[in-house]
């Protein structure tokens, strides 16, 4: 049985910077996860690996190690940051993200995260993926769940 539940809550903040010469966008995206331990003993969150995709291209990856211990029947909220780069064949996005005439420069990103937990030598991996709106035109702090993008057709399995 799935004894550990991972829920991707959403984007917490996105901080943006630009390289004008390279027509490159740098987005530091902080995400929030809720990890619930339904066991009657503590489990260790060994690592979190995350990646962000834009238009089916991976634009950022991150890995956190030895994160925390979650007590029995407890939940912890964990934030993790993925540095992303929109450049090269996607440099056309630079114009959109820096266009002054638009107030909100939302782009749709796919957030993928895998949480590895361990207990008594046993490892368990749980993965989630979600589409999210992120504003690439300014620094933004989101209410949790505010950035969810629901109207995207999920790719066929």
């Amino acid at each position: 049985p799935r004894s550990i539940d991972v829920k991707y809550i959403g984007v917490k903040s996105a901080y943006v910077s630009y390289d004008v010469q390279k027509r490159t966008i740098y987005l530091n995206i902080t995400n929030t996860l809720n990890i619930t331990n339904n066991n009657y003993y503590s489990v260790e969150v060994e690592n979190i690996t995350a990646q962000v995709q834009f238009s089916k291209t991976v634009i950022g990856k991150a890995r956190l190690n030895n994160i925390t211990i979650i007590g029995p029947l407890d939940m912890k909220q964990i934030d993790y940051t993925v540095p992303t780069v929109i450049a090269e064949e996607m440099s056309y996005m630079y114009d959109f993200c820096t266009l002054i005439s638009i107030k909100v420069h939302n782009i749709v990103l796919m957030m993928q995260v895998t949480v590895t937990t361990t207990y008594f030598g046993h490892s368990e991996q749980i993965s989630q993926e979600r589409y999210q709106y992120v504003d690439c035109g300014r620094n933004t702090t989101y209410q949790l769940g505010q950035s969810e993008y629901l109207n995207v057709l999920q790719p066929q399995q």
């Epitope: 049985p1 799935r2 009657y40 003993y41 503590s42 007590g71 029995p72 029947l73 407890d74 207990y119 008594f120």
Partner: antibody
């Protein structure tokens, strides 16, 4: 070696309260749930409640709500159960027991030796 | 609450023979593919001792003559061959949902 050492027998008057203890050793106290169970003489077992010592979260059997109160002391790795408004129906052996470590671990892997409570005037 | 009914309430089995104890649940104790039925042995003046967890898993240090089986709402503890030291009361317990409950017990006597 995991050990659960319970406090000694109690003889109490009807209407009074009693607080018993269960001292854990041989493992990290906050890493497991502690349960309390009741066994009347010559009868079966009843689950009363459990406590998660790392945050003092409790879950009670509806039957024992208002009767039993669970607490813990992390500094001494000790769990406590207080029973109030005692009647002859509360005369029993009370066990503390620790969860197992497989899957959801919701069975009773290690047991204390039991605390006998006798309610008599 | 889930009620567990054990039968027989007492049994007498000859040394070396098979003892079979049944435990019937008033509703399913399965959750997410696991069956949350466990078996304990209790001798006079002692706390219960875990024998079998999750229907059929033998607890470490418990002799292989103990075995558990079952599905749905019907479960069985088998002891074969029975030895003198197996004289005790046996309880089934479920943890499918709160509150966890026990069967009424089955007292095994060795003939």
């Amino acid at each position: 070696e995991v050990q659960l050492q319970q406090s000694g027998p109690e003889l109490v008057k009807p209407g009074a309260s009693v607080k018993m203890s269960c001292k854990a050793s041989g493992y990290t106290f906050t890493n497991y749930v502690m349960h309390w169970l009741k066994q009347k003489p010559g009868q079966g077992l009843e689950w009363i409640a459990h406590i998660t010592p790392h945050n003092d979260g409790t879950k009670y059997n509806e039957k024992f709500k208002g009767k039993a109160t669970l607490t813990s002391d992390r500094s001494s790795s000790t769990a406590y159960m207080e029973l109030n408004s005692l009647t002859s129906e509360d005369s029993a052996i009370y066990y503390c027991a620790r969860s197992g470590q497989f899957g959801r671990g919701d069975y009773f892997h290690y047991w204390g030796q039991g605390t006998t409570v006798t309610v008599s005037s | 609450d889930i009620v567990l009914t054990q039968s027989p309430a007492s049994l007498a089995v000859s040394l070396g023979q098979r003892a079979t104890i049944s435990c019937r649940a008033s509703k399913s104790v399965s959750t997410s593919g696991s069956i949350y039925i466990h078996w304990y042995q209790q001798k006079p003046g002692q706390p219960p001792k875990l024998l079998i967890y999750l229907t059929s898993n033998l607890e470490s240090g418990v002799p292989a003559r103990f075995s558990g089986s079952g599905s749905g709402t019907d479960f069985t503890l088998n002891i074969h061959p029975v030895e003198e030291e197996d004289a005790a009361t046996y309880y089934c317990q479920h943890s499918g949902e709160l509150p966890w409950t026990f069967g009424g017990g089955a007292r095994l006597e060795i003939k």
